[in-house]
């Protein structure tokens, strides 16, 4: 079986998936569902997954949820929250995805793949 995916490749694939989501918005993403905003800092992959995993019935982000789980070292389930969430701020999934995409672009440019 193939070896582990290099971090740079995994991050690139995640960015490409977020690009696809951003590009293919014909109607409000996930019917305009709201999710908790997160601090885009260390541990953000788990925080992002914790936030998005609470969105159900939205096929557009299912692949993103799976990909984020590959970046998060622990199992994440719905209703689970870390200190990285800005618990007083909810934003639309579309805005969440855009913010995450732009932050990951910065990380990729800076060579911060983990």
């Amino acid at each position: 079986s193939p070896g582990p995916v290099p971090p740079s490749t995994a991050l690139r694939e995640l960015i490409e998936e977020l690009v696809n989501i951003t590009q293919n918005q014909k109607a409000p993403l996930c019917n305009g569902s709201m999710v908790w905003s997160i601090n885009l800092t260390a541990g953000m992959y788990c925080a992002a997954l914790e936030s998005l995993i609470n969105v159900s019935g939205c096929s557009a982000i299912e692949k993103t949820q799976r990909m984020l789980s590959g970046f998060c070292p622990h199992k994440v389930s719905a209703g689970q929250f870390s200190s990285l969430h800005v618990r007083d701020t909810k934003i639309e999934v579309a805005q969440f995805v855009k913010d995450l995409l732009l932050h990951l672009k910065k990380l990729f440019r800076e060579g911060r793949f983990n």
């Epitope: 690009v19 951003t22 590009q23 918005q25 014909k26 579309a94 805005q95 732009l102 990729f108 440019r109």
Partner: antibody, heavy 122, light 108 residues
């Protein structure tokens, strides 16, 4: 230092053809999407065409689709624009621009050439 | 196709703040870039990804984007800031790059 140098502009009659080139240096050419943007005299910027880093995906403005063809030779670090069936309204300065990320669609253009003037007139 | 609307001109006194708007339907969901173009010169990227500044661009240049309006803000305007400014997005519904019509900034 990133450099983009356009060439191939000039005077051409309506219905004629022209091929623009953009020689790139100072960056890993194949890793970035590239684009052509034009500016008619005294007018604003108008996007013409774009191409992915591999050359596998191409995009065109409606005004040039079917007449212009964008391509690239990554072994020569060169971007091309083949312009056929030229019209008077194609008269403009044509800029070559580098996308600031490998996926050229959502990103901006961080480096531009100085442009080459194309004049379509009889 | 997607349309970006900019005011044709904005005037401001030196030292004041200039705000150049770029209107578009739900532009807040898109990623906006801004270019400065001086007469006879190629455009220069001054703000990318809504609000980031390329290296070498003064901190006086900043951007924001939400709702139906993106804004380029130039604080402490200098005479050298006089130029045309263009906003730009990618329109995924048409697979086109879209530029605004441009705004001429005049420093009084």
């Amino acid at each position: 230092e990133v450099q983009l140098l356009e060439s191939g502009g000039g005077l051409v009659q309506p219905g004629g053809s022209l091929r623009l080139s953009c020689a790139a240096s100072g960056f890993t050419f194949s890793s970035y999407a590239m684009s052509w943007v034009r500016q008619a005299p005294g007018k604003g910027l108008e996007w013409v065409s774009a191409i992915s880093g591999s050359g596998g995906s191409t995009y065109y403005a409606d005004s040039v689709k079917g007449r212009f063809t964008i391509s690239r030779d990554n072994s020569k670090n060169t971007l091309y624009l083949q312009m056929n069936s030229l019209r008077a309204e194609d008269t403009a300065v044509y800029y070559c621009a580098k996308a600031d990320f490998w996926s050229g669609t959502l990103w901006g253009f961080d480096y531009w050439g100085q442009g080459t003037l194309v004049t379509v007139s009889s | 196709s997607y349309v970006l609307t900019q005011p044709p001109s904005v005037s401001v006194a030196p030292g004041q703040t200039a705000r150049i708007t770029c209107g578009g339907n739900n532009i807040g969901n898109k990623i906006v870039h801004w270019y400065q173009q001086k007469p006879g010169q190629a455009p220069v990227l001054v703000v990318y990804d809504d609000s980031d500044r390329p290296s070498g661009i003064p901190e006086r240049f900043s951007g924001s984007n939400s709702g139906n309006t993106a804004t380029l803000t130039i604080s402490r305007v200098e005479a050298g800031d006089e130029a045309d400014y263009y906003c730009q997005v990618w329109d995924s519904s048409s697979d086109h790059v879209v530029f605004g019509g441009g705004t001429k900034l005049t420093v009084l």
